[in-house]
Every structure is written in structure tokens, then in C-alpha cells.
Interface confidence: low
Amino acid sequence: SSPCPQAWGPPGVQYGQPGRSVKLCCPGVTAGDPVSWFRDGEPKLLQGPDSGLGHELVLAQADSTDEGTYICQTLDGALGGTVTLQLGYPPARPVVSCQAADYENFSCTWSPSQISGLPTRYLTSYRKKTVLGADSQRRSPSTGPWPCPQDPLGAARCVVHGAEFWSQYRINVTEVNPLGASTRLLDVSLQSILRPDPPQGLRVESVPGYPRRLRASWTYPASWPCQPHFLLKFRLQYRPAQHPAWSTVEPAGLEEVITDAVAGLPHAVRVSARDFLDAGTWSTWSPEAWGTPSTGTIPKEIPAWGQLHTQPEVEPQVDSPAPPRPSLQPHPRLLDHRDSV
């Protein structure tokens, strides 16, 4: 068996730090066997079998010119193997941030705080923080740690599924390279990192006979749970074409009638979402949708769609130890602003 411990990384590669003494190990011999060392591509003997260093090559104060492939051979000329020296630095604590697009799952991303120049991997785990007793924090099996599964495509991201909205979590991201490991711990709560995805399916339609009205409608983002315990509130902005300033309203539901549109001009509309009890932050804005008020006279009767509709209440779920949150579906306000005459 080889006398050389295999560091994590590609086979046949050994590692060192610039400015430090580096020992290279001849992999194909018995420990202590005297070997000759050559730099690949050059016949010059770097270290002979009489060095007293056995199967190792010592490079004092290695620098970038020492990087490359080395060849060792035994006394009888048998090839002992090839070793590639790669210089770099031990890991530094990675930069970690976490975000949630819904209240049941969150993801964490990371990046190196320093470039090590070496093959690097990341170990990701998390645990739920619980306090048992008055003055001590102890671990129980239900608190982890558990692995935070990483994206299969190699993106620097892991996802925690089935998180509890009211719990605190400690994320552990450890950067590992052949020269060591370094850990970043990050405490997160879903409430503080919640940022929904923007609403989807934004449509802007004219209201026949109302030259200053536009009707906007949208849906919850697909990433928000289908039967939500927690609702979203919305913020809608609109402006006529070529006007720099946005007007902002906070609709009560999934549609809004704008009553002060500029007749005859196309309008841009966009919408943003946030947890309805103000956890986390507002989403980014949805892509803009455009609409132009209709031309024509006001009809004598309010069309059927203009009547107020209510949605049935959603029963709060009580299978969670979390305090219940109000879960009424707000009434959509269709005709909430008086038309300017």
C-alpha cells in the first residue's frame, strides 16, 4: 500500500501552502525506501536516494514556480509514481446568506470569502435551535443536526424543506479543501428571511364604458403553498406611459380597479407581495403589464363582474404548536376609488 495519505481531491495531486515547506511523497514505494526525484520534463535530479529523506521530497519555502508534476523512481530505476504539486491556502469561513420564498422552506447560498486556489467542497447542515430549561441550551434528537441537501447541479445552494415558521435555525456551512476546513454558523428565522416571489399572471384590462378605469388581476406566486396558512398582501403600482412617477395602492385581494387612469394612454402596472402580517420583506416587482382604458360611454348598469364578491373563510389549522394567525381571505375591492368626474 502507498505510504502517502490521499488528501481530498483528484488522485495523484499533493498540496502545500506558498511560503511554507512542502513535503512530497512518492506513492509507489514502501515507506522509507530511498528514491530519486525528478521534475517532470527535466532530467535534473532534484533529490537523490542518499538524501536521508526516504520516499519524501522536501521543497523549502515553496512558491508558484514549484507547482507542477514531479517524478520519483526507486534505486533500481522502477518508476515510483508521479505527483502533481498544487499550492494554495487553507479554507476561510465562507460567506453565507439565506432566503425564503414561502413559509415552509428556505434556501442558503454561500461563496468563499477568500480564494484558496485548491479543489474545494462544502458541507452543509442545519439544526433547529431550542432552549430547554431556564439557562441552558441542550441538544435533543429532534433538533438535528441534519444535512442541508445541496443542489445537484453544483450551484452553491442548499434547501431546507419543511421548516417551522416560528423556529430558529442554525445553519452550518463548512468549506473543505485538502489543507483543512473552516465553518460559518448562521442563525436564521423564517420570519426575518421571508421574501415571497413576485405575484404571477398579472393582467390589465380596460373597463368598458369607463375611460379612466383599468382592472388589474393577478395570482399568488406558484412557490407559495397551495392552501396557505398564511396569506399575502399586495402592493400595486401603475403609471401612464412616459410618466416617470408611479402611483401606489395596497389592494385588499387579487384584483384592483384603478379609477384615476389617464384616458387614452397605455399604463404600466406592476405588483409586489408580502406576508400579510409583515414578516420578512416585500417581493421584487412582477414584470410590468400594460393596458389602456376603454373609450366610450358609461353603461347605465354596473356589469355583473363589478359586484362585490366575498370568498369563504379558510379554517385556521391547529395541528401546529405555533400560535394561530388570522387567515381570512381579504375581500377583493373592485370599485374602491370614486371616479373623477
Epitope: 495523484g12 509507489g28 517532470d40 527535466e42 532530467p43 535530479l45 517524478i71 522502477a78 518508476l79 509514481g81
Partner: antibody, heavy 117, light 107 residues
Amino acid sequence: QVQLVQSGAEVKKPGASVKVSCKASGYTFTNYWMHWLRQRPGQGLEWIGNIGPSDSKTHYNQKFKDRVTMTVDKSTSTAYMELSSLRSEDTAVYYCARGDYVLFTYWGQGTLVTVSS
Amino acid sequence: DIVLTQSPATLSLSPGERATLSCRASQSISNNLHWYQQKPGQAPRLLIKYASQSISGIPARFSGSGSGTDFTLTISSLEPEDFAVYFCQQSYSWPLTFGQGTKLEIK
């Protein structure tokens, strides 16, 4: 650019010796190993051995050890390979190749040695 | 001596196709395996060193993989000039030895 120019074709009788030369240019001759290889007609490649031009340290394939001698003349940047006790199965194209310690990066054009009675 | 066995002996493919050539060693040689291309009447040319390391001036369509005893040379999309004989060579122990070659011919 790196160039390896070999001596011309040879016809030898069984039992004789042949000495093939390889003149190097375009690089520092004493920095690289010189390998010798051969390829019999329609066959694969066979490594004969190598020599370190700076110290003339050689490694020979055991198959040829008793019949091959590799030398260098640093003053003319020329490497030589002599094979003795030739037999018909030594008929082949013989190549010199400048290499890393174990690789063959630049090749001569080849020298055909025919052994025939 | 370490014996290298290449397969197949002959591979018939068309330009644009992907070629996969195999080389198996009689004992583990780590990554000390190299690939050469030889065209009729020419000396061999080094394509890949140490199983997977590319060589300057060699087109990116040539790649290598493997470690231990099983190695592969892949040509992602064959060009007309790629039809030749390919040899693997080991540098794990003396004597340095070659496979018997794979002839890549136009179908």
C-alpha cells in the same frame, strides 16, 4: 522550433550492429530526456529506453538491455542508439523522441532499419 | 511488464460521430496513462497525458478519463483528419509500454 533529425535508412545483415543518430535543435539539449522507440511493420510501438542528456543516465527496456547502447554528444546536441546482434525481427522504423521523463513530446522522422541476409 | 489492451482493434465511424476508445491495464497504474495519435507515414503525436490532462495545441474535442486499470479516449465529434491509429502508453513502471493500437476508420 524543436526539431529532431535522424540518420538515413540502413540495411544490415543478421548479427551485425546498427547505430542511428538523432540531431536535436530548437531547445536546450541538456534539459530533456531522449527516448528511443521502434515500430515493426504493421505493429505497435515498443519503447527501447531513454537517456538523460545531461548525465547520460540511461534506462533500458530489459528486452534490449544486452544489445542496446545509448549515448549523447552534448557538443553537437546529438543522441545515438546502437543495437547489436541484429536479427530479422529487428526490422523496424526506429524513432528518437524528446520527452518528459516518461512522455514522448517531439519525434524524429524515423529511420528504417532492414535486417536481411 | 504492464500489458495494455486496447479495444476495439478497429472502429468504423462517420465524421461528426462520437468516438470512444478503451485501454485496459493489466494492473492498477493510477493515472499514469497517455494517448497518442499516428497517421500513416508519420510519427505519433501526444494527445492526452496522465489520463485526462490536455496537451497544448490539441483540439478540445479530444478528452481522456479513467484511473486505475480502465481508461477512455473520447473524440466528441469526429473530423476527417481524426481517422488514424490511436495508442495508449503507461508510465507507471519500467519498461514503458504501449497498447497494440485502435484503428479509427471512416465508415
